[in-house]
Interface confidence: low
Amino acid sequence: QEFLLRVEPQNPVLSAGGSLFVNCSTDCPSSEKIALETSLSKELVASGMGWAAFNLSNVTGNSRILCSVYCNGSQITGSSNITVYGLPERVELAPLPPWQPVGQNFTLRCQVEGGSPRTSLTVVLLRWEEELSRQPAVEEPAEVTATVLASRDDHGAPFSCRTELDMQPQGLGLFVNTSAPRQLRTFVLPVTPPRLVAPRFLEVETSWPVDCTLDGLFPASEAQVYLALGDQMLNATVMNHGDTLTATATATARADQEGAREIVCNVTLGGERREARENLTVFSFLGPIVNLSEPTAHEGSTVTVSCMAGARVQVTLDGVPAAAPGQTAQLQLNATESDDGRSFFCSATLEVDGEFLHRNSSVQLRVLYGPKIDRATCPQHLKWKDKTRHVLQCQARGNPYPELRCLKEGSSREVPVGIPFFVNVTHNGTYQCQASSSRGKYTLVVVMDIEAFSSH
């Protein structure tokens, strides 16, 4: 008859570091002491006729235990395989690129340390909850990779790594460990440079708007813009509309920036940069300044008129050009009555990069001269009818402007000048028309001959 040695439990599964109670029993009636062969830490708990119970502690790895006993002089054995399962100690998703270009591949890498049995351990790479890759855990540590094509939808998406220890066939369930998620930032930066709209010329101490626009940018709100005139950074206002970014700034040129300069616009996104540059000439255009040696001259005095402007500026004074750019244009005159109120015009021309810029300025001369009454405008003999309406058309001139009064000789009777009045016979007589100012007096005799009104 063949006797058996039973080992219970048969092929148990337990968590790493756990303990196991093992019972070895035989139906052999004349058996000796039962022995348990194992490399694990063991302790005999109890024994009796044909049986023995042992406690195995700190079971850390898969193991095979063997019970043996001598029955009627021959050895009989029984065995059981212990399967140890353990969750991974570490599940880590490697850092993602700080910025990932849309349309390019990037690699997800997950490292798993520990976890057994490896045959039941699977590593899953995820985007949100979508499985991107499912691979068995191989070697120690297990390192799993997946290649992913970055899209715009991936911007801000969390990626993670999950391990699944499937102990369901052993009736223990599915044990899941998940790494800390990592967020991806994707971007689109077109190869084309930004469109830069800037002036070709900029005068010192003047301001002009500068616009920089780039289309097809994603996410436009994350882009950084740098606008500068030479080494002077401009304070830009940045606006996003969809995938278009527009930066607007006001460029103001300083005196120390005169000459050939560049306006630069840099758009940076995802560690990449697109740049546009435009040439700009900063120029200084002083004047023209027209000067009179005497703004108010006496009649007969000599007046010098001069026009000047900045370096490289060609000036022309009343049609007479200066000898060379940067030099002063001048003219001299003897001040006469006819020069009073005369305007002197100066035009200035500056060449900037093949373009001619023009400016004008003028000054008015005042000539001081004594009073005069224009004989042409003041008839010396007037023949008017009684009881009619007339105007004494006399005009005086002079600088300062004179006061004009017409007084009847031998009386203080005054007739209005330049204003309509009713004429009667009492107006008959000789009048002294006198123009007076601080520069003297001028008198003209006017005779009024009033014809009496006839009743028939």
């Epitope: 690699t107 890498r109 490896r118 045959t119 691979q135 191989v138 070697e139 540590p141 390192e143």
Partner: antibody, heavy 119, light 112 residues
Framework: QIQLVQSGAEVKKPGASVKVSCKAS????????ILWVRQAPGQGLEWMGK????????TYAQKFQGRVTITADTSTSTAYMELSSLRSEDTAVYYC????????????WGQGTLVTVSS | DAVMTQTPLSLPVSLGDQASISCRSS???????????LHWYLQKPGQSPQLLIY???NRFSGVPDRFSGSGSGTDFTLKLSRVEAEDLGVYFC?????????FGGGTKLEIK
């Protein structure tokens, strides 16, 4: 093209250490595993260990544990193998090789570095 | 460790002949993921080893189709259909299913 270029031959005294370098080019260094294999004169090939340059994780053959150190410098795409406490039986040609993933074959090899240990 | 045993140690052939090398492992090379990581390398005189066949039967890029690999579990074979002068050297089988990776002792293919 993919290349692994190793440092030149070394002569060392017993008890000393040797450090062999392996510079990779033609591919992304962090995407592949670097392994070290040695071959004693007239003998077969013996695997020493490997490194994943991306994570910096290493695995060594039990025989060399405690005596070998494998490192990688990702900034220069160079792997290093240092063997200490040299003895005469360490005289061999040391090869670096790469493989794309676990646990694939070694598809490209360095030209080898002869290390001679002699008193 | 998986011990790899190659036979024969030396294989004298004439150019144009067929050649066959055997490799046996002390344990199964089937990985828990179902793949078998058994590879063949050739080391020509004075050169580094070069990959010929990976995962039992896959030819590496640039390897002529006169090389073929077969086998499963623990027994594997490398066949050369027509030996050419450039094929001479030492052939090694290798496994990477189990750590440490191990190599066979090598088979020297030489001219009769």
């Amino acid at each position: 093209q993919i290349q692994l270029v190793q440092s030149g031959a070394e002569v060392k005294k017993p008890g000393a250490s040797v450090k062999v370098s392996c510079k990779a080019s033609g591919y992304t260094f962090t995407d592949c595993i670097i392994l070290w294999v040695r071959q004693a004169p007239g003998q077969g090939l013996e695997w020493m260990g490997k490194i994943n340059p991306y994570f910096g994780t290493t695995t060594y053959a039990q025989k060399f544990q405690g005596r070998v150190t494998i490192t990688a410098d990702t900034s220069t795409s160079t792997a290093y193998m240092e063997l200490s406490s040299l003895r005469s039986e360490d005289t061999a040609v040391y090869y670096c090789a790469r493989k794309e993933a676990y646990p694939d074959a070694m598809d490209y090899w360095g030209q080898g570095t002869l290390v001679t240990v002699s008193s | 460790d998986a011990v790899m045993t190659q036979t024969p140690l030396s294989l004298p052939v004439s150019l144009g002949d067929q050649a066959s090398i055997s490799c046996r492992s002390s344990q199964s090379l089937v990985h828990s993921n179902g793949d078998t990581y058994l590879h063949w390398y050739l080391q020509k005189p004075g050169q580094s080893p070069q990959l010929l066949i990976y995962k039992v039967s896959n030819r590496f890029s640039g390897v002529p189709d006169r090389f073929s690999g077969s086998g499963s579990g623990t027994d594997f074979t490398l066949k050369l259909s027509r030996v050419e002068a450039e094929d001479l050297g030492v052939y090694f089988c290798s496994q990477s299913t189990h750590v440490p990776y191990t190599f066979g002792g090598g088979t020297k293919l030489e001219i009769k």
